[in-house]
């Protein structure tokens, strides 16, 4: 039985050229944690093994940075980053969990401007 | 702008099931569909995604009692409900769930009563 929780950064803002830390903690549970794979939409950013250590994807190694910890930090951000992002848990007992992130990456002078958006 | 009208809602009793459609003004070929929800006094929340090579992703407290699946050729995407729970009592709203969004649908009301 899946007693354990995802916490996520939420729906998050950043601006054009910058970088963001997408993280995600899994809580509520003893399960041990197997593995934990990052996901932009239906493409794999990174995968997180707990015996053979990170993985990031030729198409995004120029950009993305593993951790702090089990997180992922994307660089150089362009405008074509926004969308949603998803940690998927691989645990044992418990099997998979989920936690979704939106990042909206936003033109500097929009970003200096205070802007906000709405879920998702 | 793809305008998203949601239906299929309604009352239904612990247990059941419902399917609910999101129609598109156009073609939803290539964007990531989804679907959230919104219970009363709480905010609106992910519930599912769907991709054009039918990548899906559902949330922890959906997952293997929904199932999100989209027609291409009908520009609809669906949400399958089963085993409906009174805690999944909310209105449903379908969207692109890779745009930031300022306006909602009307979305469709489903009531689960114990």
């Known amino acids: 039985m899946m007693t354990g929780t995802i916490e996520t950064t939420g729906n998050i803002s950043a601006e054009k050229g910058g970088s963001i830390i997408l993280q995600c903690h899994l809580s509520s549970t003893t399960a041990q944690v197997t593995q934990v794979n990052w996901e932009q939409q239906d493409q794999l950013l990174a995968i997180c093994n707990a015996d053979l250590g990170w993985h990031i994807s030729p198409s995004f190694k120029d950009r993305v940075a593993p951790g702090p910890g089990l997180g992922l930090t994307l660089q150089s951000l362009t405008v074509n980053d926004t969308g949603e992002y998803f940690c998927i848990y691989h645990t044992y007992p418990d099997g998979t969990y989920t936690g979704r992130i939106f990042l909206e990456v936003l033109e500097s002078s929009v970003a200096e401007h205070g802007a906000r958006f709405q879920i998702p | 702008e793809v305008q998203l009208v949601e239906s299929g809602g309604g009352l239904v009793q612990a247990g059941g099931s419902l399917r609910l459609s999101c129609a598109a003004s156009g073609s939803i070929f290539n964007i990531g569909m989804g679907w959230f929800r919104q219970a009363p006094g709480k905010e609106r929340e992910w519930v599912s995604s769907?991709?054009?090579?039918?990548?899906?992703y559902y949330a922890d407290s959906v997952k293997g009692r929904f199932t999100i699946s989209a027609d291409n050729a009908k520009n609809t995407v669906y949400l399958q409900m089963n085993s409906l729970k009174p805690e999944d009592t909310a209105v449903y709203y379908c969207?692109?769930?890779?745009?930031?969004?300022?306006?909602w649908g009307q979305g469709t009301q489903v009531t689960v009563s114990s």
């Open positions: 969207a692109n769930s890779n745009k930031p969004k300022f306006d």
């Open positions: 769907i991709y054009s090579n039918g990548h899906t």
